[in-house]
């Protein structure tokens, strides 16, 4: 509970052993004690203790002193705790009562009487101090004190406040009397759960999780978390804030690790040479004459400059060198010369020149030839002058590159082409490759060179059906037929049913007349296929071997667009505005002969050849369909009709328009 | 180039003492916080001790404190970490570093190993 | 003290191949994170620090994310030197602590 109302009885008086009732106890009243203790009541009434009720055992006979017992039975004071904000106010009832029976549960027996009662109203604040009373009446007196405490961990005027001292991670503190909390040395905050960090420790750079500690953030350090940390990688610098890298005097570099003043320091510089505090390690040697390396540390031989001159041979000597001059030469370095022009001093055709009143000469040399004596032949192929692999040869006064095959030019820096010298026949296309020229062949051509005609008759194979006569095109490979009364069709393969009554003669004129002009498309068809037409196995070597305007009605892989989700290529006509066909399944079947595109043509009846769209492909694409349009295929120089082949995954129909 | 070479490590009993020494060479040893590291043989990494450049202030993990001091000398750009009242425990390769506790340990030594066993 | 937990604890892989090591805390450590490499019998080499910073003379294959408690160092291409030890580290609170490690192998 948060709080317990407490009474102790003192003295009990009942010198004649009376009940209440008027009769008297025999051999005497033995006395124990009910108290009941309620809200406040102006009357007390009879009704529930709200506040608590509590019964004593037998304290005595008749006349008694109660003493004080901390535990057990017949503890004194009475306790009687509550569970709520004590009011302030109360009613106490103390009823005193005679028992026959057990001595310790009184309260249980039968046959208990009532000796005598006191009815106590009041009000009562909270607190240590007992407030003791008395109550007579004609038989019995009541000595008694109470008070009202709170219980362990509640504190205030009513109890109310719950505080509960600790020393752990959730607080330090302990409760003042009114329950407020009261931290222990070293900590603050409401709760008490905030160190009171080392004096002058940075608020900012430092923090603490115990009293008298500082604990530096990330990049600051000391006592007092008021010095930074140097970048990771410094070297020889300190900061200002945090992980900078100001470098120390002396030193220089992102991270202060290069020696401003190197030389100083370490005197790389060996031999004399002089020493610079720059460059990538931080310093560079300058080497005096006749040394090398880093340091200056490699000695180079004193006859290394060839400082001979005229053809003197050099010898090293310790700290120098010496000259052994040829005849007519002397001096340290060979430089003066004893001969004159009457000793033709000159070689190889050099014309000799006086100098200072005939004491000395100087050759001019003819091309080719150099030195003082034009004893030395020039070589003009020292610059690697041939490009291309060429090998350079000095032919006298000049020098001459010798090509490799396939390459030409006075430094073989022009590339012969392989189709220079038109090896392809029968105006077969020629190409350059690595490996040499490559023919690609007309129609009706095959072979390495376009060298091999190919011979084939299109009626061999008998395509035209029911008695239809074949008629090879100008083309080896078209054949166009002609039909029997009763028959259509590109190879008259479909019967024509008739009425009984039919205009036969007006008929047939007008199936005269179309069969006649199916013909004459067919031939100009063929005349168009004719270019067009490669058998499979020629179709790659002679796909590139096309005419002038068939050149220009190429329509290559980057011209086809794909446009849309199903696969269709869609290709844009530009100037032109025929209409043309979507060519669909990326893939064109352009063998066909035009025999094989009559109207209803069958699937399956003919060879394919599905060229990829990869591939320049010859398209005649020229029909009235709206779908797309058609660029770069209509030649100025073509006068022709164009067809478009329309390849749909339903059926195949070939749509011809001609063009006068 | 950044060298830290640690000695002093050996075999020493439980109850014992030992005093590990690190030599620092190529930065400004004085400029930087210093650390101890160790790692006990087949195990992880364990940071033991901290000691700040400017003012000497020294950090340990709970289960040195009392037992092991941290301290330099800058002008012999030294670190130091003596080693009293040993423990079975503090068996490991005990490794120098340049770094704080609340920073990257840029540089490492060798390591020196210390075992401590009767 | 914040736990620092990798995973997985080891790992093998191919030269060639990319690879990723992460490394979770216990609670937030604000990007004060780094990697290190170890190899048998040497010292710890420090790779990445402050989560993703490139420590000075580290390759480029090596780079590291991650932010709040997790974090990952990845290798973009192994090669036959990177078959090591690998330890992640937190300095955002005191005292700092490390992961237990990942070992890469050669599978």
């Known amino acids: 509970g948060s709080g317990i109302f407490q009474l102790r009885l003192q003295e009990f008086v009942n010198q004649r052993g009376m009940l209440a009732n008027g009769q008297s106890c025999e051999p005497g009243c033995r006395t124990f004690f009910r108290i009941c203790l309620k809200h406040f009541q102006a009357t007390f009434s009879e009704g529930p203790c709200t506040f608590g009720n509590v019964s004593t055992p037998v304290l005595g006979t008749n006349s008694f002193v109660v003493r004080d017992k901390n535990s057990g039975s017949g503890r004194n004071p009475l306790q009687l705790p509550f569970n709520f904000t004590w009011p302030g106010t109360f009613s106490l009832n103390i009823q005193a009562w005679h028992t026959p029976g057990d001595d310790l549960r009184p309260e249980t027996s039968p046959g208990n009487s009532l000796i005598s009662q006191i009815i106590i109203q009041g009000s009562l604040a909270v607190g240590k101090i007992w407030r003791t009373d008395e109550q007579n009446d004609t038989l019995t007196r009541l000595s008694y004190s109470y008070r009202v405490i709170c219980s362990d961990n509640y504190y205030g005027e009513s109890c109310s406040r719950l505080c509960k001292k600790r020393d752990d991670h959730f607080g330090h503190y302990e409760c003042q009397p009114d329950g407020s909390l009261s931290c222990l040395p070293g900590w603050t905050g409401k709760y008490c759960d905030q160190p009171i960090c080392l004096s002058g420790c940075h608020e900012q750079n430092g923090y603490c999780s115990k009293p008298d500690e500082c604990i530096c953030r990330p990049g600051w350090q000391g006592r007092l978390c008021n010095e930074c940390i140097p970048h990771n990688g410094c070297r020889h610098g300190t900061c200002s804030i945090p992980w900078q890298c100001a470098c120390d005097e002396g030193w220089g570099g992102l991270f202060c690790d290069q020696d401003l003043n190197y030389c100083t320091h370490h005197s790389p510089c060996k031999n004399g040479s002089t020493c610079s505090n720059s460059g990538p390690k931080g310093y560079t040697c300058t080497c005096l004459p006749g040394y090398t390396g880093e340091h200056c540390e490699l000695g180079l031989s004193k006859c290394a400059s060839n400082p001979c001159r005229n053809g003197g041979s050099c010898k090293d000597q310790e700290n120098s060198y010496h000259c052994l001059c040829p005849p007519g030469y002397y001096g340290q370095h060979c430089e003066h010369s004893t001969l004159t022009c009457a000793d033709s001093p000159c070689f190889n055709g050099g014309s000799c020149r006086e100098r200072n009143q005939g004491s000395s000469y100087a050759c001019e040399c003819p091309p080719n030839f150099t030195g003082s004596n034009c004893e030395k032949k020039v070589d003009r192929c020292t610059s690697n002058p041939c490009a291309n692999g060429g090998q350079c040869q000095n032919r006298g006064p000049s020098r001459t590159c010798r090509c490799r095959p396939g390459f030409t030019g006075t430094h073989c820096e022009l590339h012969i082409s392989d189709c220079a010298r038109s090896p392809c026949a029968h105006g077969g296309t020629c190409h350059d490759l690595e490996n040499g020229p490559v023919c690609t062949c007309p129609a009706g051509f095959s072979g390495r060179r376009c060298e091999v005609r190919i011979t084939h008759d299109a009626c061999a194979s008998g395509p035209c059906f029911n008695g239809a006569t074949c008629y090879t095109g100008l083309s080896p490979n078209n054949f166009v037929c002609n039909c029997p009364y009763g028959f259509v069709g590109s190879r008259c393969e479909f019967p024509v049913g008739l009425p009984p009554s039919f205009p036969w003669v007006a008929v047939s004129l007008g199936v005269g007349l179309v069969v006649l002009l199916v013909l004459l498309v067919m031939v100009v068809v063929a005349v168009r296929q004719l270019r067009l037409r490669r058998p499979d196995d020629e179709s790659r070597e002679a796909m590139n071997n096309l005419s002038d305007f068939q050149k220009d009605n190429l329509i290559p892989a980057a011209q086809l667009k794909n446009t849309n989700q199903k696969k269709e290529l869609e290709v844009d006509c530009g100037l032109d505005k025929s209409n043309c066909g979507k060519l669909q399944n990326h893939t064109l079947d352009y063998n066909l002969a035009p025999g094989l595109l009559g109207r209803g043509g069958m699937p399956g009846k003919y060879p394919h050849s599905d060229k990829s769209l990869g591939e320049k492909v010859p398209l005649r694409l020229h029909s009235e369909k709206p779908e797309c349009r058609i660029s770069a295929i209509c030649s100025p120089r073509d006068s022709m009709y164009q067809s478009v082949c329309l390849i749909s995954e339903e059926r195949n129909e070939c749509v011809i328009a001609t063009e006068v | 180039e950044v060298q830290l070479v640690e000695s002093g490590g050996g075999l020493v009993q439980p109850g014992g003492s030992l005093r590990l020494s690190c030599a620092a060479s190529?930065?400004?040893?004085?400029?930087?916080?210093m650390a101890w590291v160790r790692q006990a043989p087949g195990k992880g990494l364990e940071w033991v001790a901290t000691i700040s450049s400017s003012d000497g202030t020294t950090y340990y993990r709970d289960s040195v404190k009392g037992r092991f001091t941290i301290s330099r000398d800058n002008a012999k750009s030294s670190l130091y970490l003596q080693m009293n009242s040993l423990r079975a425990e503090d068996t490991a390769v005990y490794y120098c570093?340049?770094?704080?506790?609340?920073?990257?340990?840029?540089?490492w030594g060798q390591g020196t190993l210390v075992t401590v066993s009767s | 003290d914040i736990q620092m937990t990798q995973s997985p604890s080891s790992l093998s892989a191919s030269v060639g191949d990319r690879v990723t090591i992460t490394c979770r805390a216990s609670e937030d450590i604000y990007s004060n994170l780094a990697w290190y490499q170890q190899k048998p019998g040497k010292s710890p080499k420090l790779l990445i620090f402050d989560t993703n910073n490139l420590a000075d003379g580290v390759p480029s294959r090596f780079s590291g994310s991650g932010s709040g408690t997790d974090s990952t160092l990845t290798i973009s291409s192994l090669q036959p030197e990177d078959f090591a030890t690998y330890f992640c580290q937190q300095y955002n609170n005191y005292p700092p602590t490390f992961g237990q490690g990942t070992k890469l192998e050669i599978k």
């Open positions: 570093s340049r770094g704080y506790y609340n920073s990257p340990f840029a540089y």
């Open positions: 190529g930065f400004t040893f004085s400029n930087f916080p």
